[in-house]
Amino acid sequence: EICGPGIDIRNDYQQLKRLENCTVIEGYLHILLISKAEDYRSYRFPKLTVITEYLLLFRVAGLESLGDLFPNLTVIRGWKLFYNYALVIFEMTNLKDIGLYNLRNITRGAIRIEKNADLCYLSTVDWSLILDAVSNNYIVGNKPPKECGDLCPGTMEEKPMCEKTTINNEYNYRCWTTNRCQKMCPSTCGKRACTENNECCHPECLGSCSAPDNDTACVACRHYYYAGVCVPACPPNTYRFEGWRCVDRDFCANILSAESSDSEGFVIHDGECMQECPSGFIRNGSQSMYCIPCEGPCPKVCEEEKKTKTIDSVTSAQMLQGCTIFKGNLLINIRRGNNIASELENFMGLIEVVTGYVKIRHSHALVSLSFLKNLRLILGEEQLEGNYSFYVLDNQNLQQLWDWDHRNLTIKAGKMYFAFNPKLCVSEIYRMEEVTGTKGRQSKGDINTRNNGERASCESDVLHFTSTTTSKNRIIITWHRYRPPDYRDLISFTVYYKEAPFKNVTEYDGQDACGSNSWNMVDVDLPPNKDVEPGILLHGLKPWTQYAVYVKAVTLTMVENDHIRGAKSEILYIRTNASVPSIPLDVLSASNSSSQLIVKWNPPSLPNGNLSYYIVRWQRQPQDGYLYRHNYCSKDKIPIRKYADGTIDIEEVTENPKTEVCGGEKGPCCACPKTEAEKQAEKEEAEYRKVFENFLHNSIFVPRPE
């Protein structure tokens, strides 16, 4: 029996009965917030073999092992994850072992096992046999391994029953509990699953099977399940659903889920039955079940009940996220804010059409309107008094409307009005008239030439770069010395630079009047010698990184009532030189025979250029005699193996502790202080833990139904 669409068991342990007949949970399984310790021994769900999304356990008092509850849980598919995790075990006060001895595969996602004060048998499970990648697993804050004394079946009797694998250079027995080994299939099966008797399953099986080489005997399917058979792809006239089974069109047409209730129903696209058309596609008609590609960004019509939408904060802008057509009027009134330009672009950057008018007033935080980066049409179906459909009043820091070289904007009906924008040059307004097709509509007073641009250098000369030199982390640039009509009007230069992977940045990207700026700024004084060209050394840059750079002359902006000339350069794109890459990450080695080592690693986080090859070096190490000095059959503390560099975690040593040796000197001294990198890593770790815990609480604490 398939159960769905996600089962949430909380408060009352008797709700577990809902799992009685489930073989597959199509969705997630939450078991949480059961504060009264209960006896779970009478609850057993041997039919449950697959969870298609994730398993979350949180604060279930009295539960000591999952093995009795779910003895046959074999696969967690992770089709949807809980904060990147397919298995979350968090704050389970009484859990002593996980015990999911039949769990063979977590198809997608990692595991997070945290703050379980009594939980052991974590180091005895080889998660690499269950998951593709173990690097994202997070197993922290559980019972310390040295207090666990985890022993696999038969170890005490010197008749070990479990198989061994290597984890972190430790070759050891693998088990889930004192009496349950971790199942491993014969190497002859390769990536295939196997039966309890170690016979290889059909290639389409996942996890396990009841008979060898039979695609109808699988416990779970590697790809898709249809009519009792595991198939590599869904047969004709059936469609992939929830990442694991094939359904027909009728099933897909009739789905009414709580998640999709507001939509127009599920769609069939690319052989899959899904909730919505994927990114870049739109329904072929409002009630269609099929998707067609969008031309440009997919349209999303947003409407304001009150006709006029006031954008006075990031929160109000957030309501327009994804909108491409706004039915109504936009009133932008941004007086202050943090990182406002990029936030507005994030939420309003897709708007292409406004059916009414656009009014920008008292928006002292704005330097540019480029956050409306896709606006191409203002219809002006509704206009302000005086027939204005674009109205810009009293914006103290507005310097740019849009980059008119890369912008087509049409104002279909209505006039423009500009007043009291002291940093907005009139030439910029006239350019907008040309582009938008409104030239001739405005009357004389609609564009005020006195109070627009009164505090700006409105006629710019072009500064030309004369030389550029690069190294791995430095750029040296020089430019022509700028000579305004009166040399006293030139104060200094400002160099702006930032990382620019693509050659598509503009001067006003991410810039607002409240201090946020995606550009780094450096002031450059005038060279005292009039014959020397001004220049700068930019240092502390990243190797093999493209930067955008431009220079502005800082000039006195007003000489009585005359506008004076300013100067700035074009944007220059320049790449630093390549450098030595950082170290490869997550180096793992394992032996698969007496004469071979398999070494795996991930690429360096900072390649600092184009990687062409890796160098692998190895050397033979003497066998460590220390390993033979301990009776491994005793249940005492078992020492951790020494690492290659010779350091040991003192707490793990069972003999007389030695004082830690620090630096090059022999003899006692304090523990070495943590490096900045270590402190930063710890800080990030703590932050990450908080973020996860907040996510967990926000996800699971919900108002009581009815």
Partner: antibody, heavy 117, light 112 residues
Framework: QVQLQESGPGLVKPSETLSLTCTVS?????????WNWIRQPPGKGLEWIGY???????NYKPSLKDRVTISRDTSKNQFSLKLSSVTAADTAVYYC??????????WGQGTLVTVSS | DIVMTQSPLSLPVTPGEPASISCRSS???????????LQWYLQKPGQSPQLLIY???NRLYGVPDRFSGSGSGTDFTLKISRVEAEDVGVYYC?????????FGQGTKVEIK
């Protein structure tokens, strides 16, 4: 895989309240769909009574609205029908059924309720 | 309420022969979203109803292709191209476009 099972007394006295429960297995009633009651008097046609949706909202047949209540118990994954002030005309086989975006896809097997003193 | 009127109420048929059932609504059952939620259900003796056709003409997966639905607005038809013995039972049309949802009174198909 989804199963619906009606349960309740087979005999109700006139003027009393008819109470039936539909137990759903294989799908959470809060996860989606509309959970309906439909009846069929002996030898007659089908009559839709009303539904409770996954979010708890109701819709009833107007002519029965004053007498009918459909509620749910999410912890037991059940929904219920209460029909007050019953008469002999309410004698019928009562079905619970799941309705999706378009059609009824799963039905219970039906339970006969007789109104008689 | 929208009244769904079926005809005939009884339909004796010979196996292998075609059959046709009409269903007429008292007003248009086109939903505001443009869809027409007209279904046909078959109730075999002693069983719960089962779906045959949804949204006027979409045959449910697994229903034999001898069943077909057609119509629009207020007039709808279910056709069986060649009746078989297993097709006996009561056929109901149903509209789910406007609340309250309503069934037709049923057409009993029996073998002559």
């Amino acid at each position: 895989q989804v199963q619906l099972q009606e349960s309740g007394p087979g005999l109700v006295k006139p003027s009393e309240t008819l109470s039936l429960t539909c137990t759903v297995s294989g799908y959470s009633i809060t996860g989606g769909y509309l959970w309906n009651w439909i009846r069929q008097p002996p030898g007659k046609g089908l009559e839709w009574i009303g539904y409770i949706s996954y979010d708890g909202t109701n819709n009833y047949k107007p002519s029965l609205k004053d007498r009918v209540t459909i509620s749910r118990d999410t912890s037991k994954n059940q929904f219920s029908l209460k029909l007050s002030s019953v008469t002999a005309a309410d004698t019928a086989v009562y079905y619970c059924a799941r309705h999706g975006r378009v059609f009824f896809d799963y039905w219970g097997q039906g339970t006969l309720v007789t109104v008689s003193s | 309420d929208i009244v769904m009127t079926q005809s005939p109420l009884s339909l004796p048929v010979t196996p292998g022969e075609p059959a046709s059932i009409s269903c007429r609504s008292s007003q248009s059952i086109v939903h505001s979203n443009g869809n027409t939620y007209l279904q046909w259900y078959l109730q075999k003796p002693g069983q719960s109803p089962q779906l045959l056709i949804y949204k006027v003409s979409n045959r449910l997966y697994g229903v034999p292709d001898r069943f077909s639905g057609s119509g629009s607005g207020t007039d709808f038809t279910l056709k069986i191209s060649r009746v078989e013995a297993e097709d006996v039972g009561v056929y109901y049309c149903f509209q789910g476009s406007h609340v309250p949802w309503t069934f037709g009174q049923g057409t009993k198909v029996e073998i002559k």
